[in-house]
């Protein structure tokens, strides 16, 4: 197809050689077409499009991406030729940085359903350069963490060394959707919730005497829990005595709740106390039975093939530990009567 009618956008990706980072291109179809297509509509219902809207499907994956080879060869289908580039709905994700990503990328609807749709395409000229500005040593990371329940902020990596006063107007997107109220180089979050997690894109315009282009950076934001200040607690056994039948097999379960730690080295073990002696028991591997953002619940069982008279004189102790401290719970076996 003829790409001369495509609208054109120039983008710059300046990547840090120190960190892994991703990049995205949105299929920014001209506004009226986009309203029926990529659901990135910014028209109010009262605004009438200047020409007929694109009559395409509402299926968000219904766009086709191509790369235009610099030697003038025919357009190449992205999906077939570039394994490090992923199409997700209307967005093209670049998984690895590198100057070899520089080039012209074209997107258009797969289904052309009206004569107006022929020019329904966008050509994005992407220039990729390694960051050379050594004066900005502490630029914001492309992976930023927000602590749940606290105040936080998301900084635009390409502008993080500039003061708010110097900063140009920034356009922010979250998971591909425009955040229309955010215009500064930093998004301030008054209280962090899970839903603040996602892929943020910040764009600003840079110009010289000849042309202007969009400088874009992508930030992966994670919401995290602060490291626990508590030692683990034992959820089971609760009682310190357990009624048993002599000669029968017995399994005693120890379940403990460990709070989140970035460096997580939980200890959960059983040992036996018999008068003055104490020894650790070889028991089956510990296993996590529940995993949430805040807690990991880990279980470890002690298995007795046959309860003996001697076992009634012993104490079975579950010991759990994290970096903060340890907790124990002991169980004394008692013979069931009658």
């Amino acid at each position: 197809f003829n790409i001369s009618g495509c609208s054109t956008k120039k983008l710059l990706w300046t990547y840090s050689t120190r960190s892994e980072e991703e990049f995205v291109l949105f299929c920014d179809l001209p506004e009226p077409q986009k309203s029926h297509f990529c659901h990135r509509n910014r028209l109010s219902p009262k605004q009438v499009p200047e020409h007929l809207p694109f009559m395409g499907s509402n299926d968000l994956s219904d766009v086709q991406w191509y790369q235009q080879p610099s030697n003038g060869d025919p357009l190449e289908d992205i999906r077939k030729s570039y394994p490090h580039i992923i199409q997700d709905k209307c967005t093209l994700h670049f998984l690895t940085p590198g100057v070899n990503n520089s080039g012209s990328y074209i997107c258009r609807p797969k289904m052309i359903k009206s004569p107006y749709d022929v020019a329904c395409c966008v050509k994005m000229i992407l220039e990729v350069k390694p960051q050379t500005n050594a004066s900005c040593e502490y630029s914001a990371s492309h992976k930023q963490d927000l602590l749940l329940g606290s105040t936080g902020s998301i900084s635009c990596p390409s502008l993080s060394c500039q003061s708010d006063a110097q900063s140009p107007a920034v356009t922010w997107y979250k998971n591909g959707k425009l955040l229309s109220v955010e215009r500064s180089n930093r998004i301030v979050v008054d209280e962090v919730y899970d839903y603040h997690q996602g892929t943020y894109v910040c764009d600003y315009t840079q110009s010289d005497t000849v042309s202007s282009w969009t400088v874009r950076a992508v930030v992966q934001v994670r919401t995290i829990v602060g490291d626990t200040k508590l030692k683990p607690d034992i959820l089971d056994p609760v009682e310190d005595t357990l009624e048993v039948e002599l000669g029968k097999p017995l399994t005693i379960s120890c379940k403990a709740r460990f709070g989140f730690e970035r460096v997580f080295n939980p200890v959960i073990k059983w040992y036996i106390k018999d008068s003055d002696l104490e020894w650790e028991v070889s028991v089956p591997e510990a296993k996590s039975i529940k995993s949430t953002l805040k807690d990991e619940i880990i279980e470890r069982n002690i298995i007795l093939e046959k309860v003996t008279q001697r076992d009634l004189r012993r104490k079975f102790v579950c010991f759990v530990q994290n970096s903060i401290g340890n907790t124990t719970q002991s169980v004394q076996l008692k013979e069931k009567r009658g």
Partner: nanobody, 115 residues
Framework: DVQLQESGGGLVQPGGSLRLSCAAS????????LGWYRQAPGKPRELVAS???????NYADSVKGRFTISRDNAKSTVYLQMNNLKPEDTAVYYC?????????WGQGTQVTVSS
């Protein structure tokens, strides 16, 4: 730190079999859910199969009856036995362990099904 190392990928003809292994280190307990994911060129990563600490399993519809996930707790290893492979199974296969509901990934192993 959690480390996951996949192996066993390679080139195989349609109808053939492969067995992928994922060795976990830096974990002192059996993870709640271990999974195999795959990513074909130009496509998002998708779940292939997962196994819980209680050994219950879950499979993507496209691999049911052909793939089997299992774990060797003594060796902290999870396996994916892939039979009757098809060209559409071609992808990079990744091992995944969820701890504190967060994903930990291996580097991946390439599986190519082609005649």
């Amino acid at each position: 730190d959690v480390q996951l190392q996949e192996s066993g990928g390679g080139l195989v003809q349609p109808g053939g079999s492969l067995r992928l292994s994922c060795a976990a280190s830096g974990i002192s307990f059996r993870v709640n859910v271990l999974g195999w994911y795959r990513q074909a060129p130009g496509k998002p990563r998708e779940l292939v199969a997962s196994i819980s600490s209680g050994d219950s399993t879950n499979y993507a519809d496209s691999v049911k009856g052909r793939f089997t996930i299992s774990r060797d707790n003594a060796k902290s290893t999870v396996y994916l036995q892939m039979n009757n492979l098809k060209p559409e199974d071609t992808a990079v296969y990744y091992c995944n362990a969820r701890i504190f509901a967060r994903d930990n990934w291996g580097q991946g192993t390439q599986v190519t099904v082609s005649s």
